[in-house]
């Protein structure tokens, strides 16, 4: 079952997700998507990182923390009721089926 997080309409929502990088110059790609984590990748991707940078994002989504040290928590700006639902944080460790998947439920009041 998903861990539940709450935010109020018009505020910013925070969805935590963390990992420990092996080395600063060798980050693990991460994707965030709207909807539960599928078998591979993220569905409806809202943000993605590569070995160094955030390389894809949509306008209201960002990583406010130090993602290069493994804080890949997602901030969603100025949420509405439509932002309610399940979000997937997927940490894409190398190797087959090594990904760590986290489903987080966002409830907007």
């Amino acid at each position: 079952s998903e861990v539940e997080y709450r935010a109020e309409v018009g505020q910013n929502a925070y969805l935590p997700c963390f990992y420990t990088p092996a080395a600063p110059g060798n980050l693990v790609p991460v994707c965030w998507g709207k909807g539960a984590c599928p078998v591979f990748e993220c569905g409806n991707v809202v943000l993605r990182t590569d070995e160094r940078d955030v390389n894809y994002w949509t306008s209201r989504y960002w990583l406010n923390g130090d993602f290069r040290k493994g804080d890949v928590s997602l901030t969603i700006e100025n949420v509405t009721l439509a932002d309610s639902g399940i979000y997937c944080c997927r940490i894409q460790f190398p190797g087959l089926m090594n990904d760590k998947k986290f489903n987080l439920k966002l409830v907007i009041k």
């Epitope: 390389n55 994002w57 406010n64 290069r68």
Partner: antibody, heavy 114, light 108 residues
Framework: QIQLQQSGPELVTPGTSVKISCKAS????????INWVKQRPGQGLEWIGW????????KYNEKFKGKATLTVDTSSSIAYMHLSSLTSEDSAVYFC???????WGQGTTLTVSS | QIVLTQSPAIMSASPGEKVTLTCSAS???????LYWYQQKPGSSPKLWIY???NLASGVPARFSGSGSGTSYSLTISNMETEDAASYFC?????????FGGGTKLEIK
């Protein structure tokens, strides 16, 4: 102490190419990214791209793809930027900067003129 | 790409005056990777403030930085003549990394 020492000024003709160097010292060259930045006279700064000397991996600003090529020589701790098909728009000061943009080279002035 | 808009583009301040420079991002960026640089004519940019609010080595305590998400600022509590320079904000969380257009701060 950490230092980035760049090559000297260049005066070249349009259509030619140039290779600018950035010699790193005071740290383990292969452990940290090198960034390259362009500044035209009296204007702002533009990020060109980075290279990770440990692997040779590169990433370019889309605007500079096909214009700039980043390489390294790990044996001498030197990062290079090759600029091709030069035009007057490429006249600028080019900086190398350290992994976290905390250390910068002194800049290399490139003038493209016929 | 993320556009960083700095304002004002040029400003003058008297010694002792409080000065605030702003940097607005077109989309949210990590506060860990929002930096400010000081640049004087003929010199390389110098790291001035890193991770939004941390002063680089040797930067006087009259400087401070704050912000998060899409809105950041650099403040000088008491302007001094040596502070006359151009200041650039910079984000290097999202690729391509981008710089603001700069604020040229002059002494009155």
């Amino acid at each position: 102490q950490i230092q980035l020492q760049q090559s000297g000024p260049e005066l070249v003709t349009p259509g030619t190419s140039v290779k600018i160097s950035c010699k790193a010292s005071g740290y383990t060259f292969t452990d940290y990214y090198i960034n390259w930045v362009k500044q035209r006279p009296g204007q702002g700064l533009e990020w060109i791209g980075w290279i990770y000397p440990g692997s040779g991996n590169t990433k370019y600003n889309e605007k500079f793809k096909g214009k700039a090529t980043l390489t390294v020589d790990t044996s001498s701790s030197i990062a290079y930027m090759h600029l091709s098909s030069l035009t007057s728009e490429d006249s600028a000061v080019y900086f190398c900067a350290g992994d976290r943009f905390d250390y910068w080279g002194q800049g290399t002035t490139l003038t493209v003129s016929s | 790409q993320i556009v960083l808009t700095q304002s004002p583009a040029i400003m003058s301040a008297s010694p002792g005056e409080k000065v605030t420079l702003t940097c607005s991002a077109s989309s949210g960026v990590s506060s860990s990777y929002l930096y400010w640089y000081q640049q004087k004519p003929g010199s390389s940019p110098k790291l001035w403030i890193y991770s939004t609010s941390n002063l680089a080595s040797g930067v006087p305590a009259r400087f401070s930085g704050s912000g998060s998400g899409t809105s950041y600022s650099l403040t000088i509590s008491n302007m001094e003549t040596e502070d006359a320079a151009s200041y650039f904000c910079h984000q290097w969380s999202n690729s391509p990394y981008t710089f603001g257009g700069g604020t040229k701060l002059e002494i009155k």
